[in-house]
Interface confidence: medium
């Protein structure tokens, strides 16, 4: 038995370009949380798979809010390590997965929303009893710097907490039997002591107060027999009891199922069927409640506070898996139409519409200039999904609605002076100037620099734009 | 039945290497303790290497501490020793044997035992 | 390690006389905590690989007949056969599971 630690130094933007927008916001405060899953052995098993091992959940960090403009720092983290106990040996060889979950505190509907902004998984060998173990992983654009080890608890010791050690009983030797448990001189290793009153003949342990039963027997102390129907065993009846050894053993002879769990036998091996509260292979994993906090994104937890009734998380919309820890991608099923974007917001799905559609999947195409009228003789136009009209002279606005006052602009060059008009505008145009807007000079010799002058026109009268 | 069969022995010359084998079935292995145990010709039985139930703890004699590898693989039933640098010391017949439980319990089957020889 | 000494390295019997076999280890594999001494006895015959007696000292294993029997605390043990049979002629291993795993030398028992 141990313990597993995780000390997390940082987490915040990694090295090179691309830095992450801050996980918080003025508007939405938040702090950080961490989830660790430990799996023995050098497993490549998805992220859902049980942590056979063991799990923990940080606390929560301290709030944060971003400043303004500043690029996302090393965010506060919470204080103390992640401890995951392990019951039996040190596997040396594990898998793990370190998660790195945002708490929303702003006012979320139903409590504080929980989103998953990292995951990082490795693969690594360490010896129980070492140093720390320093890693960095990064995910994304963000990087997670952390320090791990495994330590035994007394009376474990050793490099993978198997070899049991005590106090010497007395100062110059180990007492009877015992090997000095090196490096601690001072302890002696211990045989097992299995759970009182397991049948010495029928019953074994490999962990202290265990009892685990020989093939042909049952129950807490192992001392019923299977079968005693008849003693077919080739090795026939135990001269200890009366009880019979079953022929033929099969799977789930003396019950690999921990913690009360049900054996049936498969095709090639077994499977327990576990009590609430308990999972894994043999159901030796022990129950998590509602009160350590197993339900994610705001799932709702439902079960018992003691650790024999296990727990259900009832997950938000967008959230799946047994802790609401797996975002469904409902964008992936393409909801939005006609080349809308899709938005996923967690707690709502939103469609960003093209122009020219509309509706909560941008299923309406719509007739730009239905129910448009455009004012005082304008024209409305289609194009581009909005609509737009094309006013008649003096008028102009969005609808036509405005009164046009085309001298605004200062549409007369050279110092000519505009007269706004019912059909227009008109430049009287300053001496030595002419043209519709006062942009030819007038030559010395009297000749325009225009061919020649509209009819009904002098050069030197007020040019009208036409 | 119990049964343990093993395998993997020969004729090896000294500071080779060589993998013993033992197909455990009858049982369900993945609940035993098992061990390997030598016995060099005319002479007593010397233990080599334990390993518990689920693989995860390894027991060795000081004679052979850092050459040989004790393992098992519990989805094929079967219990490994890897042995290297071997010495001409090393010669025996080597028996795989089931403890009755644990490791801290007594052995009671064992294989009939392949013979390992090194000789240059 | 513990060291298991056995004696005599060799006995022989009558049949139907009574054989006894003592074994002495270095240290107790009496522990105190569940009161059970780790000790087993084991008969090997000709070409055969070790087979189990008895486990805790004391306790027969199943299908071994009555007349062996194991007795003894600490320090020493004691392996006796009430009985000789012609069957039983062997050489007979204690072994110590306290710490690690250690045998006697081997007793070798013949008929007289």
């Known amino acids: 038995a141990g313990v597993f630690e995780l000390q997390i130094h940082s987490f915040g933007p990694g090295p090179g370009p691309g830095a992450p927008r801050s996980p918080c916001s003025a508007r939405l405060p938040c702090r950080l949380f961490f989830r660790v899953c430990l799996k023995p052995g050098l497993s490549e098993e998805a992220a859902e798979s049980p942590c056979a091992l063991g799990a923990a959940l940080s606390a929560r960090g301290p709030v944060y809010t971003e400043q303004p403009g500043a690029p996302a720092p090393d965010l506060p983290l919470p204080d103390g390590l992640l401890q995951v106990p392990f019951r039996d040996a040190w596997p040396g060889t594990f898998s793990f997965i370190i998660e790195t979950w945002r708490e929303e505190l702003g006012d979320q509907i139903g409590g504080p929303a929980w989103s998953l902004l990292a995951r990082v998984a490795g693969r690594r060998r360490l010896a129980a009893g070492g140093p720390w173990a320093r890693d960095i992983q990064r995910a994304g654009a963000w990087e997670l710097r952390f320090s791990y080890r495994a330590r035994c608890e007394p009376p474990a010791v050793g490099t993978a907490c198997t070899r049991l050690c005590r106090p010497r009983s007395a100062p110059s030797r180990c007492g009877p039997g015992l090997r000095p448990c090196a490096p601690l001189e001072d302890e002696c290793e211990a045989p097992l002591v299995c759970r009182a009153g397991c049948s010495p003949e029928h019953g074994f342990c490999e962990q202290p107060g265990e009892c685990r039963c020989l093939e042909g027997w049952t129950g807490p102390l192992c001392t019923v027999p299977v079968s005693t129907s008849s003693c077919l065993s080739p090795r026939g009846p135990s001269s200890a009891t009366t009880g019979c050894l079953v022929p033929g053993p099969g799977p789930c002879d003396g019950n690999p199922c921990a913690n009360g769990g049900s054996c049936s036998e498969t095709p090639r091996s077994f499977e327990c069927t576990c009590p609430r509260g308990f999972y894994g292979l043999r159901c030796e994993v022990s129950g998590v409640t509602c009160a350590d906090g197993p339900c994610f994104n705001g799932g709702l937890c439902v079960g018992g506070a003691d650790p024999d009734s296990a727990y259900i998380c009832h997950c938000p919309p967008g959230f799946q898996g047994s802790n609401c820890e797996k975002r469904v991608d409902r964008c992936s099923l393409q909801p939005c139409r006609n080349g809308g974007l899709c938005l996923d917001l967690g707690h709502a799905l939103r469609c960003r519409c093209r122009a020219g559609f509309a509706g909560p999947r941008c299923e309406h195409d719509l007739d730009d200039c239905a129910g448009r009228a455009c004012a005082n003789g304008g024209t409305c136009v289609e194009g581009g999904g909005a609509h737009r009209c094309s006013c008649a002279l003096g008028f102009g606005g969005r609808d036509c609605r405005e009164r046009a006052d085309p001298c605004a602009a200062r549409p007369c060059a050279h110092g000519g002076r505009c007269y706004a008009h019912f059909s227009g505008l008109v430049c009287a145009c300053a001496p030595g100037y002419m043209g519709a807007r006062c942009e030819f000079p007038v030559h010395p010799d009297g000749a325009s620099a225009l061919p020649a002058a509209p009819p009904g026109l002098r050069p030197g009268d007020p040019q009208r734009y036409l | 039945e119990v049964q343990l069969l093993e395998s993997g022995g020969g004729l090896v010359q000294p500071g080779g290497s060589l993998r013993l084998s033992c197909a455990a079935s009858g049982f369900t292995f993945s609940s035993y303790a098992m061990s390997w145990v030598r016995q060099a010709p005319g002479k007593g039985l010397e233990w080599v290497a334990a390993i518990n139930s689920n693989g995860g703890r390894n027991y060795y004699a000081d004679s052979v501490k850092g050459r040989f590898t004790i393992s098992r693989d519990n989805s094929k039933n079967t219990l490994y020793l890897q042995m290297n640098s071997l010495r001409a010391e090393d010669t025996a017949v080597y028996y795989c044997?089931?403890?009755?439980?644990?490791?801290?319990?007594?052995?009671?089957?064992w294989g009939q035992g392949t013979l390992v020889t090194v000789s240059s | 390690d513990i060291v298991m000494t056995q004696s005599p390295d060799s006995l022989a019997v009558s049949l139907g006389e009574r054989a006894t076999i003592n074994c002495k280890s270095s240290?107790?594999?009496?522990?105190?905590?569940?009161?059970?001494?780790?000790l087993a006895w084991y008969q090997q015959k000709p070409g055969q690989p070790p087979k189990l007696l008895i486990y805790w000292a004391s306790t027969r294993e199943s299908g071994v007949p009555d007349r062996f029997s194991g007795s003894g605390s600490g320090t020493d043990f004691t392996l006796t056969i009430s009985s000789l049979q012609a069957e039983d002629v062997a050489v007979y291993y204690c072994?110590?599971?306290?710490?690690?795993?250690?045998f006697g030398q081997g007793t070798r028992l013949e008929i007289k």
């Open positions: 240290q107790s594999l009496l522990y105190s905590s569940n009161q059970k001494n780790y």
């Open positions: 044997a089931r403890h009755r439980g644990g490791y801290y319990y007594a052995m009671d089957y």
């Open positions: 072994q110590q599971y306290y710490t690690y795993l250690t």
